[in-house]
Amino acid sequence: SIPWNLERITPPRYRADEYQPPDGGSLVEVYLLDTSIQSDHREIEGRVMVTDFENVPEEDGTRFHRQASKCDSHGTHLAGVVSGRDAGVAKGASMRSLRVLNCQGKGTVSGTLIGLEFIRKSQLVQPVGPLVVLLPLAGGYSRVLNAACQRLARAGVVLVTAAGNFRDDACLYSPASAPEVITVGATNAQDQPVTLGTLGTNFGRCVDLFAPGEDIIGASSDCSTCFVSQSGTSQAAAHVAGIAAMMLSAEPELTLAELRQRLIHFSAKDVINEAWFPEDQRVLTPNLVAALPPSTHGAGWQLFCRTVWSAHSGPTRMATAIARCAPDEELLSCSSFSRSGKRRGERMEAQGGKLVCRAHNAFGGEGVYAIARCCLLPQANCSVHTAPPAEASMGTRVHCHQQGHVLTGCSSHWEVEDLGTHKPPVLRPRGQPNQCVGHREASIHASCCHAPGLECKVKEHGIPAPQGQVTVACEEGWTLTGCSALPGTSHVLGAYAVDNTCVVRSRDVSTTGSTSEEAVTAVAICCRSRHLAQASQELQ
Amino acid sequence: QEDEDGDYEELVLALRSEEDGLAEAPEHGTTATFHRCAKDPWRLPGTYVVVLKEETHLSQSERTARRLQAQAARRGYLTKILHVFHGLLPGFLVKMSGDLLELALKLPHVDYIEEDSSVFAQ
């Protein structure tokens, strides 16, 4: 029967008694930077080309005995998970292996850098189809390793890495912390985060998604027909590398940003038990388990968006946090969140010719997060319209006044330390849909975009008094681009998007002593692209 | 872009006085930074990745590496250039004493220096 991990990543329409998805990734080359591998293992023979690249440190210990099967163990298993004949994800993908880890599974940042450079030079000398680079390794945070990954990603290479097995914030490790890399955490057959001894999978905002990573059957270097079960975020990353290979084989022109958005979009949502993660990391960690798309073509019509959390601002009075989208993504909205509730909102601002989302801490606050909603919107022309604090009783408002521009997000930012002491308007008159409305003491920022066929609508859900959280979701066929809270009072901790749901968090009414007058409303802006839908229909 | 003393020969460098003066200072007064792994057991002191500014050419990288070697030799230190990077990042990998970091950070074109560290199979 089909191994649990292959079943988990397979959409129901492919599930027969065996795993045989349509395209095995045959147009894609997957580079594996790992230990040496047994390339003639029955499971992978002819699929893996062992390059002559080797850069490894000497093994520790004077009595270390180099046993070939042990030296090859990690890499052979991963090659099998990516492209193995019987237990592999992308059975048609061809692989190239570089040895950067020694027989004890240890390497260096410098060796990895030289390996990445080798791949780039190979790509320049002999350009092939799409390239996926699998980095099933982790070290401490490294500026230079992250920079090298960024350069390779900008050269059109898809990098996939293990989040790390340290039961820790993945942002403290490299290459897991590199924003351009697809960072993968590990889950088990019960969709729980994987525990590995006293440790386990890493988590946090630097993880893009999770994938099967416990008891994964794959090629064993013990013999040419042997299989073995291994666990770790390397195994999880290998699944995503395989899925990426299959997606790229079906659509070779996909950019890294498009691929990442598709991986997120087709993942199983909200199946991981978040209680396993430290409380402060739960909101930051994506509840996504990787899966193959139900059909290899035809996802192009969708408006894809993802949520990007910033690093924590830190607690100083003027501290700010910045969340950035990838180069070919559009920032369609910006929100902020603070566990203490002490924040001064957020604003979208230009930085280096690109919009970023900046959140502001408030005096006495423990710090804030900026949350960017990053979307794929071809031929988009977006701008930010700002209205300064109105000071008048009806609140501040701003709308998209340019012809053909639609509202995709609202942000508000205030200078006063605590909006809660400044009574908000009791009534909020309904304006036109292209309008942001906010507290009279706040400046309001509207994200206005023009893109072919783009249409958006506002959806609200309010409750009379805060109860921890209010949510509002976009319906099928619409994508959440903006998420904000009304009003911006002190008991609102912030707003953020989780998949297609806008979540507004607030302090419980019992702890704040708020009145029902301070109703909290979650405001979602839901968009879709008629242009993308039409283009896709014309292709079919 | 080439720095004004980029064409100096190693021999000339070697003959200059101990107080190398302004020629060693990074251009535009920016200070290169040093980075190392926060996890102490994973550090590999003695090997450093010297990362040069983005537009640095391979020839400049090689020249900067030679300059470091020459200046280190004058101070009585042996250094070994293990690899010159180009294609992804400009720079070089050098085996040297940590005592030379201050000197290396002042070299022209240097953006930052990172001490090598371990990575592990996951």
């Epitope: 047994q38 003639d40 002819g46 080309m49 062992v50 019987d86 013999c223 | -």
Partner: antibody
């Protein structure tokens, strides 16, 4: 192009040994092992075993285990199959083939065991 | 006694389609994606026609196709031609080895 070239025909007495060679070329040798298959006159194919060119590991079929030895000489890209204690039942054409997938075959070596 | 069962012979007229079956168990054909089919003309080494159940090596005519259902694999040859007359063998992985079928003689009438 990918080629497997085998040694010439052999005639052996019962109880003797035979050593057949197979020289590989045209591909990355370590990416594939070599399988040995035999075919008795008018009969089907029988898999005898496999050897790794990468590390010399072997996997022998139960039927010939103990009588067969497969070896490699990486310097000459040649693989050898030695079969001992021959009997008339071992009269067959012996083929080497690339890997377990057996996508490329040698031309075959006829081994005749006769007293 | 071969581990995989094939019909001893099949025949068909030029232009027709024929199918050769190869039956094993869940420990071989049913358990692996690696069923291969070989064509062998008299006095020649076998030639790989289908690998991994349904894949054709480059250079093999699209008239040859493979499939599998449960523990039985099949080779179908459409638009039968005189040069297709040969012996056909299936093979499959087992947990530690390889097994062949007894072979099927295809006669083109």
């Amino acid at each position: 192009q990918v080629q497997l070239v085998q040694s010439g025909a052999e005639v052996k007495r019962p109880g003797a040994s035979v050593k057949v060679s197979c020289k590989a070329s045209g591909y990355t040798l370590t990416s594939y092992g070599i399988s040995w298959v035999r075919q008795a006159p008018g009969q089907g194919l029988e898999w005898m075993g496999w050897i790794s060119v990468y590390n010399g590991n072997t996997n022998y079929a139960q039927k010939v285990q103990g009588r067969v030895t497969m070896t490699t000489d990486t310097s000459t890209s040649t693989v050898y199959m030695e079969l001992r204690s021959l009997s008339s039942d071992d009269t067959a054409v012996y083929y080497c083939a690339r890997g377990y997938g057996m996508d490329v075959w040698g031309q075959g070596t006829t081994v005749t065991v006769s007293s | 006694q071969s581990a995989l069962t094939q019909p001893a012979s099949v025949s068909g007229s030029p232009g027709q389609s024929i199918t050769i079956s190869c039956t094993g168990t869940s420990s071989d054909v049913g358990g692996y994606n690696s069923v291969s089919w070989y064509q062998q003309h008299p006095g020649k080494p076998p030639k790989l026609m289908i690998y991994e159940v349904s894949n054709r090596p480059s250079g093999v005519s699209i008239r040859f196709s493979g499939s599998k259902s449960g523990n039985t694999a099949s080779l179908t040859i459409s638009g039968l031609q005189a040069e297709d007359e040969a012996d056909y063998f299936c093979s499959s992985y087992t947990s530690t080895s390889m097994v062949f079928g007894g072979g099927t003689k295809l006669t083109v009438l």
